[in-house]
């Protein structure tokens, strides 16, 4: 005979669960489906990841997202995790928003990002609900910098980047400062491949770095080079 009262709690059907913290009166729920739509848009050494919530929330409101990163070396095809070498705009686990920016990506590397959706009962199943997106980083190569000439008060510096990338660059930014003086620096912008830094102190070492500026933002910066002006005993202009 049927019981005169309803049961105080019901067993969940297969594939449905109650989380340990769920009250017995709460309906049975299940893990969410994968994020519905994921895009990865590369901008220089950054990637913006955007996704839409799962179509099936599993009947729960407590959805969070985790982002993981894998990098692959194009020459060898070998891959490995890259959490240690990239920077996320916010901690990549337990995200409640549906976007994140990943920066400090390396030029000419292939990246695969995985976004996983989880809710309060995801830990009760072994399967995962995730979507992946891949992106290749095509940031400009760091400029190769040379000292072309120097005098007691000037340094003539030139640089190059591979010809196929030159059309993407609208200007170059040259940053320089006296060695040992980290409080002040000078910046010069130019469209060409060389610059003469004037009004420098004699017999002094300067730190010089060149960075390409592209439509997507900054290209990779060159090495920080140390160039030294001539001492007053040195003769006039000297080509190196």
């Amino acid at each position: 005979l049927p019981s005169p009262e309803g049961a105080t709690s019901c067993e969940c059907e297969e594939g449905f669960f109650r989380a340990p913290q769920d009250p017995a009166s709460m309906p049975c729920t299940r893990p969410p489906s994968a994020p519905h739509y994921l895009t990865a848009v590369g901008m220089g050494a950054k990637v913006e990841l955007r996704w839409t919530p799962p179509q099936d929330s599993g009947g729960r409101e407590d959805i969070v997202y985790s982002v993981t990163c894998e990098q692959c070396w194009p020459e060898s095809g070998e891959c490995g995790p890259c959490e240690a070498s990239v920077r996320y705009s916010e901690p990549p686990h337990g995200l409640t928003r549906t976007s994140v920016t990943v920066s400090d990506l390396e030029p000419h590397m292939n990246y695969t990002f995985t976004v996983e959706a989880r809710n309060g009962v995801s830990g009760l199943v072994t399967s995962r609900s995730f979507r992946t997106a891949s992106v290749s980083i095509n940031q400009t190569e760091p400029p190769k910098v040379r000292l072309e000439g120097r005098s007691t008060t000037s340094l003539s510096v030139s640089w190059s980047i591979p010809p196929p990338q030159q059309s993407r660059v609208w200007k170059y930014e040259v940053t320089y400062r006296k060695k040992g003086d980290s409080n002040s620096y000078n910046v010069r912008r130019t469209e060409g491949f060389s610059v003469t830094l004037d009004d420098l102190a004699p017999d002094t070492t300067y730190l010089v770095q060149v960075q390409a500026l592209t439509q997507e933002g900054q290209g990779a910066g060159s090495k920080v080079h140390e160039f030294q002006t001539l001492s007053p005993e040195g003769s006039g202009n000297l080509a190196v």
Epitope: L147, K179, T205, K223, F227, Q228
Partner: antibody, heavy 127, light 108 residues
């Protein structure tokens, strides 16, 4: 081919001064910045400081108050003194030569790679 | 002060490729040098200026550096490559030389 030969007292008591010397054979002290580096047992490398032939020095900030590096160009030698030693200063101490001259035609190489190292001197501080 | 971060240990089977990383803020703008050190011996320079090899160092040692990570790659690893490996840079902001903490490479 340049060779580095180093020597100095191996056993010290706390608060004493560690003194080591490094002789450069087969080359001149000029044009290079010469370094001292140490390695405590089972640990990593730590740069102590550097000196050039004219006596200009640059020290690791964590040791600066206790370190003196000097040069004797007539003997082609440079030396390290570390005062007020404690057990934490127990280490193998190395002298080292950078790969390239410090500056050539206006292009300088601070913190260059070290291609030649002394044989190392174990200094133990114990009461 | 500038900090270089290396994994304490890396294990690899003979014949495989080992990758040892050296992390530091904007390390790509610095020249990175790598040393191999075997027990009881002074360090030996294996790669300088990110990717160049001194004479006498075999081709199996190579390096790369960009962004925040420099990498020493040892291809076709053999038992004789088992050692500690250190990265080194010059920090131009403080004018001081910095070593990474070292990575012990174990050949399985």
């Amino acid at each position: 081919q340049v060779q580095l030969q180093q020597w100095g007292a191996g056993l010290l008591k706390p608060s004493e001064t560690l003194s080591l010397t490094c002789a450069v054979y087969g080359g001149s002290l000029s044009d290079y910045h010469w370094s001292w580096i140490r390695q405590p047992p089972g640990k990593g490398l730590e740069w102590i400081g550097e000196i050039n032939h004219s006596g200009s020095t640059n020290y690791n900030p964590s040791l600066k108050s206790r370190v003196t590096i000097s040069v004797d160009t007539s003997k082609n030698q440079f030396s390290l003194k570390l005062s007020s030693v404690s057990a934490a200063d127990t280490a193998v101490y190395y002298c080292a030569k950078p790969f390239r001259p410090h500056c050539t035609n206006g292009v300088c190489h601070s913190g260059d790679a070290f291609d030649i190292w002394g044989q190392g001197t174990m200094a133990t501080v114990s009461s | 002060s500038y900090v270089l971060t290396q994994p304490p240990s890396v294990s690899v089977a003979p014949g495989q490729t080992a990758r040892i990383t050296c992390g530091g803020n904007n390390i790509g703008s610095k020249n990175v040098h790598w040393y191999q050190q075997k027990p009881g011996q002074a360090p030996v320079l294996v790669v300088y200026d990110d990717s160049d090899r001194p004479s006498g160092i075999p081709e199996q040692f190579s390096g790369s550096n960009s962004g925040n990570t420099a990498t020493l790659t040892i291809s076709r690893v053999e038992a004789g490559d088992e050692a500690d490996y250190y990265c080194q840079v010059w920090d131009s902001s403080s004018d001081h030389l910095v070593f990474g903490g070292g990575t012990k490479l174990t050949v399985l």
